[in-house]
């Protein structure tokens, strides 16, 4: 059980376009055809103005026009919904496809890609139907931009909603060695395939990826619950042979000062194929990027039933230590270390200011509205208070 980490099953709430909890001031665009098709008219199911946001420029052949939504705080965005222009039911403009870009700080923008590296998302086939896109992988973002596309010169218009939840972890990035490849009857790729930071010299830094996506790996690391993905997909792994130090070192950066109770590391323990829980974990703490590591490291030796080959969450007590940066060393106890998820149980230290983008206004943990129910291309069945967007259709 990954206590303290977000549950993807509860992270599918409408984030406030349709119900207007996202104010007009947080919706902007690269351009607008007219004031009646300005960015503020881009709310899903709204008929305001001329019924959508429509850019002034053509989106073909250049794809430079965008609609931007500022969520004001970091959110995990799990789905997006799009619609074309309403115009009293007479609108004919919609976008057959689009791209997404997102940012956590307003400075560095990342392009969203699916698990196979595809950036283009299938959009609408008509102006009125809502098309919901499950974002696999989800994105941790404060700002999201929609870039409509067209395959010829034509007018495109958009109405949108975002679905997800507040990113409570406060984790901004983790730094880790690049995951490696294990060779069995087939190659098992244990890289962090959704990492959105930088990779230089065998080190990934400045981003988030599969270790913070809410997806917990299975007992057999060759298997995944994701469709048509490669072996080892859910895990990031490292071989003992590549680390003469005997450990893998990772660093974690948070949004503000936090008192850390525990770290949860979901590990594989399929020792028949070389994967072992770490023999121990050692963590150091500091309050700022240029500061010294404070005090003695927290050390935790792992006990328990190490012979049980099932994957599991290992809890590492962190003793309430206060920090914004953690550096943890995971000691090898076998040929391979395989992690699928790392999360933290922590409390924000009062009066600590956020590291990104100025001060954020308060936001509720659960956004107010469930997903809309009148989707044309996907059947959605909100069940009571559950934020469930249920898609029925081909799993492919």
């Amino acid at each position: 059980d990954m206590k303290g980490h977000f549950d993807p099953a509860k992270c599918r709430y409408a984030l406030g376009m349709q119900d207007r909890t996202i104010p007009d001031s947080d919706i902007s665009a690269s351009s607008s055809w007219s004031d009646s098709t300005a960015a503020r008219h881009s709310r899903l199911e709204s008929s305001d103005g001329d019924g959508a946001w429509c850019p002034a420029g053509s989106v073909f052949p250049k794809e430079e026009e965008y609609l931007q939504v500022d969520l004001q705080r970091l959110h995990l965005v799990a789905l997006v919904g799009t619609q074309g222009r309403h115009a009293g039911g007479l609108g004919k403009e919609f976008s057959r496809s689009y791209r997404l870009r997102y940012s956590r700080d307003g400075r560095r923008w990342m392009g969203w890609k699916d698990r196979w590296g595809q950036e283009v998302i299938s959009g609408n086939e008509d102006p009125e139907g809502v098309v919901l896109k499950d974002l696999g992988p989800p994105m941790v973002a404060r700002l999201v931009r929609f870039y409509p596309r067209a395959d010829r010169v034509m007018s495109v218009c958009l109405r949108v909603e975002l679905y997800g939840c507040l990113w409570r972890d406060g984790l901004l990035s983790y730094t880790a060695p690049v995951g490696q490849t294990m060779y069995l009857s087939e190659a098992v790729y244990l890289n962090d395939s959704t990492y959105d930071g930088h990779t230089v010299g065998g080190l990934q830094y400045g981003g988030l990826g599969q270790l913070a996506d809410g997806v917990v790996g299975l007992d057999d690391f060759r298997k995944s619950q994701e469709l048509r993905v490669w072996p080892g997909y859910d895990y990031v792994g490292w071989s003992n042979h590549s680390f003469s130090s005997g450990y893998v070192e990772m660093e974690f950066e948070f949004d503000r000062l936090r008192a850390f109770q525990a770290m949860q590391v979901h590990c594989n323990n399929m020792h028949t194929l070389g994967a072992r829980l770490p023999g121990g974990v050692e963590c150091r703490f500091r309050r700022g990027p240029a500061m010294a590591w404070e005090g003695e490291p927290m050390r935790h030796n792992l006990g328990g039933n190490l012979g049980d080959p099932r994957a599991r969450a290992v809890s590492v007590p962190l003793g309430g230590r206060v920090a914004r940066f953690l550096q943890c060393r995971f000691l090898f106890a076998g040929p391979w270390l395989l992690f699928s998820e790392i999360s933290f149980i922590s409390d924000v230290v009062n009066n600590s200011s956020p590291a990104l983008g100025g001060t954020f206004p308060p936001a509720p943990w659960w956004p107010p509205g469930p997903p809309p129910t009148n989707f044309s291309s996907l059947e959605l069945e909100p069940r009571g208070q559950q934020p469930v967007a249920k898609a029925e259709g081909s799993p492919t």
């Epitope: 993807p8 099953a9 599918r12 196979w116 499950d134 009857s185 087939e186 917990v216 299975l218 007992d219 057999d220 060759r222 298997k223 995944s224 619950q225 994701e226 469709l227 048509r228 993905v229 490669w230 072996p231 997909y233 099932r310 469930v388 967007a389 249920k390 898609a391 029925e392 259709g393 081909s394 799993p395 492919t396």
Partner: antibody, heavy 119, light 111 residues
Framework: EVQLVESGGGLVQPGGSLKFSCAAS????????MSWVRQTPDKRLELVAI????????YYPDSVKGRFTISRDNAKNTLYLQMSSLKSEDTAIYYC????????????WGQGTSVTVSS | DIVLTQSPASLAVSLGQRATISCRAS??????????MHWYQQKVGQPPKLLIF???NIESGIPARFSGSGSRTDFTLTINSVEADDVATYYC?????????FGGGTKLEIK
């Protein structure tokens, strides 16, 4: 030890309804997609419903679409299959299986529960 | 729909000999460099049991005499040194494209 135990089969008339359940134990149920697979009297296997680990996504082949509904309760470690408008060609042994959504097939199966649709 | 054709429909092999079962798909079951073809064993009165996943990976607990190979449309399940306990019907299944389909089965008997 992984265990999947189905219940709820029986004899039903054409046009009738039936609901199965499958109690899972020995693994983290909420981490796995689940399926219902049926085996017809001529021993052919047909996957009739899949649900992903969180229960958001479901899939049905055309032969049962609109008549069968797969669901799950992760708090109770239980998978369900609601069948309605039953036809004689739905007569089969119905197996609950772990997997289906995923990249590895179905790695554990229950013992099956028998359904006979006949007047 | 992808149609899986297994051959032979039945097979009689002497103890200790090799058994080879073929599964041919009507279109490729490969995606992103992987073959999404799986093999199951079903003994009389029992549910199917996963033997091989993604064409060549032996499921945990399955004896090493079972192996799988192939790609795109042509796949083979091989049982080296058949034992009496291997008497069963063997099915292939693809999970590359919905609807996920099974082959018609190959019945293995001891000669």
């Amino acid at each position: 030890e992984v265990q999947l135990v189905e219940s709820g089969g029986g004899l039903v008339q054409p046009g009738g309804s039936l609901k199965f359940s499958c109690a899972a134990s020995g693994f983290t149920f909420s981490s796995y997609g689940m399926s219902w697979v049926r085996q017809t009297p001529d021993k052919r296997l047909e996957l009739v419903a899949i649900i992903n680990s969180h229960g958001f996504s479901t899939y049905y082949p055309d032969s049962v679409k609109g008549r069968f509904t797969i669901s799950r309760d992760n708090a109770k470690n239980t998978l369900y299959l609601q069948m309605s408008s039953l036809k004689s060609e739905d007569t089969a042994i119905y197996y609950c299986a772990r997997g289906g959504y995923g990249n590895y097939g179905m790695d554990y199966w229950g013992q099956g529960t028998s359904v006979t649709v006949s007047s | 729909d992808i149609v899986l054709t297994q051959s032979p429909a039945s097979l009689a092999v002497s103890l200790g000999q090799r058994a080879t079962i073929s599964c041919r798909a009507s279109e490729s079951v490969d995606s992103y460099g992987n073959s999404f073809m799986h093999w199951y064993q079903q003994k009389v009165g029992q549910p199917p049991k996963l033997l091989i996943f993604r064409a060549s990976n032996i499921e945990s607990g399955i004896p090493a005499r079972f192996s799988g190979s192939g790609s795109r449309t042509d796949f083979t399940l091989t049982i080296n040194s058949v034992e009496a306990d291997d008497v069963a019907t063997y099915y292939c299944q693809q999970s590359n494209e919905a609807p996920y389909t099974f082959g018609g089965g190959t019945k293995l008997e001891i000669k």
